[in-house]
């Protein structure tokens, strides 16, 4: 059962796992949610009746029954983890805490103009978990405007104390706001020889990399595969760090793989969601339950539905035993990973999917694309929306993309002459325009946010956000697309598609069925040569065939240029402008979304 409200002046008795320090009960709940075992917590707020050394303590708790006895206690705030909830969860915490000093290892001290600048510095520093900033009113003259970057083993403060005229806050890496490079490369036959901060068991290097990504201290990792010569180290995932933030050296070792934390691009990759099955593999751990199940998929469902289950092993039925049902072993451990991984025993293992909601919804795999043809099929581009105007009569105006449950990203030039959001309707999950009837459900638009530097499409800043009046419930036919990561600027996208209901040639009409075309990206230098009369800026991106023939056209504006990278779709461009349609040596010009990620996040994450 999902309980989101906090229980004031209430303490949960017993079940303690560990104690951390958090600046608020709300953040304590987030820490509990991300902890592998925590189901409940008790936070102690500052209060004259409480011992100051207990202020800001966040006690993480577990219980076999998923609840604990409640006791009345002033200044105590208790609650439940969001693990029991189905809604999207984020570790992003933009709050600034006034007059609080969050203690940790102060590894960097510098002057900053503001708390915001200090927070940005922390976000762009590989080691930084949180910061404390002494304001210009701070009593000690030599400490004024000092920005202290801090880290700890757990990512949370070791203590929090009251201190006048300072403010504290957390790194915004988990808000997708870091400019740090995202090093996605995995290095085969490689060991990184630096300090191990932790080690866990993992079935493959990808799971090891995801564990590293959400571990607060891990910057890179080494994984020993199941063929590793030393038996005791097989499937071992070593989580590592170094002072420089990078490995000091690389050592060649067969059957080992190494890679980096993807912390700075974690919003566009699955981090918590280990959805694969591992055949002929047994995960060992504390047994929670043994249940009969028809298949390993059914076993995974059982594990996902059992809030304390972290991973499972399914042993298929022997011949016609037990109505063809096998045994499903639901398991857990102190860190969420198997305590040992064994091979060759015939089991099929995997992880709970309960934690998938901690990942951005946009990373969910969608149904395979239909290759060939130009007409799309239902669910192929679930982020694509059709934006209609109702004035003077209802018609398709532009395309757009779902990027959040209340947000559509589109082009600014679509709103030329649009006086009010009231005349706009957003239809999602649509394949054919003919599906749209009087009674077809739509999303009203609450607000149109046009980039304030926009003048005309050709001069750039052709980007706009629509805030919907109601939230989108994600389904297979309507779900968001990931924004590209700022740390991924060097990624070369080779699988890019433009979609829309626009014209198929210059003099044409809006198409009934959503059209798709695979189009290669063109370098900005090449694009500039094709548009000598225009300035192709780094905030634009071009795509098209030299010979022409495939392109976006009138009516596709505002729609996505979607590129698949590492099995995840990214919104690389917004259809903006071009000379004619699909003309030879005239690529389409798109708004380069990665250059506007900060702007998008600023507008969509505004409190």
């Amino acid at each position: 059962e999902c309980v989101t409200q906090l229980l004031k002046d209430t303490c949960f008795e017993g079940g303690d796992i560990t104690t951390v320090f958090t600046p608020s009960a709300k953040y304590c709940q987030v820490v509990c949610t991300y902890h592998p075992r925590c189901l409940l917590f008790t936070f102690t707020a500052e209060s004259p009746s409480e011992d100051p050394t207990r202020w800001f303590t966040c006690v993480l708790k577990d219980s076999v029954t998923e609840t604990l006895p409640r006791v009345n206690r002033t200044a105590a705030i208790s609650g439940y983890s969001f693990k029991q909830c189905s809604h999207q969860i984020s570790a992003c915490n933009k709050d600034i805490y006034v007059d609080l000093d969050m203690k940790g290892i102060n590894y960097n001290s510098s002057v900053a103009k503001s708390a915001q600048e200090c927070q940005e510095r922390c976000t762009d520093d590989v080691h930084c978990h949180f910061f404390t900033y002494a304001t210009r009113q701070f009593p000690s003259l030599e400490h004024r405007n000092i920005c202290l970057l801090k880290h700890t083993q757990t990512g949370t403060p070791t203590r929090i104390t009251k201190l006048d005229k300072v403010v504290s806050g957390f790194s915004l890496k988990s808000c997708a706001l870091s400019n740090l490079a995202c090093i996605r490369d995995i290095f085969p036959n490689t060991v990184f020889a630096d300090s191990n901060i932790d080690s866990v068991m993992a079935p493959d290097a990808f799971v090891c990399g995801r564990i590293c990504t959400h571990h607060p201290g891990c910057l890179f990792f080494t994984f020993f595969s199941q063929e590793w010569p030393k038996e005791s180290q097989r499937n071992l995932c070593l989580l590592k760090t170094s002072e420089s933030g990078l490995p000091s050296t690389r050592i060649k070792k067969s059957k080992a793989l190494s890679g980096f934390s993807l912390q700075s691009c974690r919003h566009s990759i699955p981090v918590f969601c280990h959805s694969s099955f591992y055949h002929d593999t047994d995960f060992l751990g504390e047994e929670l339950d043994i249940v009969a199940a028809k298949s390993h998929e059914a076993c995974q469902k059982l594990c996902t539905n059992a809030v304390r289950c972290q991973f499972f092993t399914y042993t298929p039925a022997q011949a016609s035993c037990n109505e063809g049902k096998g045994k499903c072993y639901l398991k857990l451990s102190s860190n969420g990973s198997p305590t040992k991984i064994l091979h060759g025993r015939g089991g099929i293992s995997g992880y709970t999917l309960r934690l998938c909601k901690m990942d951005n919804e946009c990373t969910t795999k969608i149904k395979p694309r239909i290759v060939g043809g130009t007409a799309s099929v239902r669910g192929e581009w679930p982020w694509q929306v059709t934006l209609h105007t109702t004035s003077p009569t209802q018609r398709h105006l532009c395309g757009g993309s779902i990027i959040g449950n209340q947000w559509i990203l589109t082009a600014a030039h679509c709103f030329y002459g649009v006086e009010s959001p009231k005349i706009l309707r957003v239809y999602s999950g649509i394949l054919n325009q003919s599906e749209i009837k009087e009674d077809t459900s739509f999303f009203g638009v609450q607000e149109i946010i046009i980039h304030d530097q926009y003048k005309m499409a050709e001069s750039g800043y052709d980007i706009a956000l629509l805030k919907l009046e109601t939230t989108v419930n994600y389904t297979d036919s309507q779900r968001p697309i990931c924004l590209p990561s700022k740390g991924d600027r060097n990624v070369i996208y080779t699988d890019c598609w433009v979609t829309g209901w626009g014209y198929r040639k210059l003099r044409d009409k809006i198409q009934n069925t959503l059209q798709k075309a695979k189009i290669p990206l063109v370098t900005n230098e090449e694009c500039q040569k094709r548009y000598r009369g225009h300035k192709i800026t780094h905030k634009m991106i071009c795509a098209g065939y030299r010979e022409g023939g495939k392109d976006a056209c009138k009516g596709d504006s505002g729609g996505p240029l979607s590129c698949k990278h590492n099995e995840v779709w990214h919104l690389v461009g917004i259809t903006s402008w071009g000379e004619g349609c699909a003309q030879r040596e005239r690529p389409g010009v798109y708004t380069n979304v990665v250059e506007y990620v900060d702007w998008i996040l600023e507008k969509t994450q505004a409190v």
Partner: antibody
Framework: EVQLLESGGGLVQPGGSLRLSCAAS????????MAWVRQAPGKGLEWVSS????????LYADSVKGRFTISRDNSKNTLYLQMNSLRAEDTAVYYC???????????WGQGTLVTVSS | DIQMTQSPSSVSASVGDRVTITCRAS??????LAWYQQRPGKAPKLLIY???TLQSGVPSRFSGSGSGTDFTLTINSLQPENFATYYC?????????FGQGTRLEIK
């Protein structure tokens, strides 16, 4: 066919700067780790620097650390070496090479000569 | 850092001969060693990696052996085009190091 073409070499005074480029073709450049290796006249080979496919991690020989910067532009299939505070001992033919999973330099360019002299 | 030492620094041989070049690492490098051939005025070419694995397209008269600290490159039945300089390279860890080279010349 894999091709690596270095350019940007020439004569430069000690303390000066030079930027080498290496244009790659015939393979998926963004999938490969790349490196610069140099060879002083009549001498052996010396590894200078390497860069991973994403460009996010670079490694340098101690002899050039802090003076040279390796970078890449995957959209242009080009590798770069920015050389600052050049010394006479940096005089060499500079080769651009691909670094394979075998931990060997699989393919090499023809090299570009850098001469540091007053 | 690992240092590599090649011997001899030069060797003279005739077409059809069998030649052996040795390479020693300053510390154990398992079998992580590569061999290169460089003809005058040309770029080096990878011949062998992992001490004994022939790079594709390299004639079978080239062979490599050894592990730990001592390695050898053997060329059977020398051909005119094999007269060049040969380098070993440790592939155990960064920084990558090459041997100083062995010049193979016609007797």
């Amino acid at each position: 066919e894999v091709q690596l073409l270095e350019s940007g070499g020439g004569l430069v005074q000690p303390g000066g700067s030079l930027r080498l480029s290496c244009a790659a073709s015939g393979f998926t450049f963004s999938d490969y780790e790349m490196a610069w290796v140099r060879q002083a006249p009549g001498k052996g080979l010396e590894w200078v620097s390497s860069i991973v496919p994403s460009g996010g991690w670079t490694l340098y020989a101690d002899s050039v650390k802090g003076r040279f910067t390796i970078s890449r532009d995957n959209s242009k299939n080009t590798l770069y070496l920015q050389m600052n505070s050049l010394r006479a001992e940096d005089t060499a033919v500079y080769y651009c090479a691909t670094w394979g999973d075998s931990w060997g330099f699989d393919f090499w360019g023809q090299g570009t000569l850098v001469t540091v002299s007053s | 850092d690992i240092q590599m030492t090649q011997s001899p620094s030069s060797v003279s041989a005739s077409v059809g001969d069998r030649v052996t070049i040795t390479c020693r690492a300053s510390q154990g490098i398992s079998s992580w060693l590569a061999w290169y051939q460089q003809r005058p005025g040309k770029a080096p070419k990878l011949l062998i990696y992992d001490a004994s694995t022939l790079q594709s397209g390299v004639p079978s008269r080239f062979s490599g052996s050894g592990s730990g600290t001592d390695f050898t490159l053997t060329i059977n039945s020398l051909q005119p085009e094999n007269f060049a300089t040969y380098y070993c390279q440790q592939a155990d860890s960064f920084p990558i190091a090459f041997g100083q080279g062995t010049r193979l010349e016609i007797k």
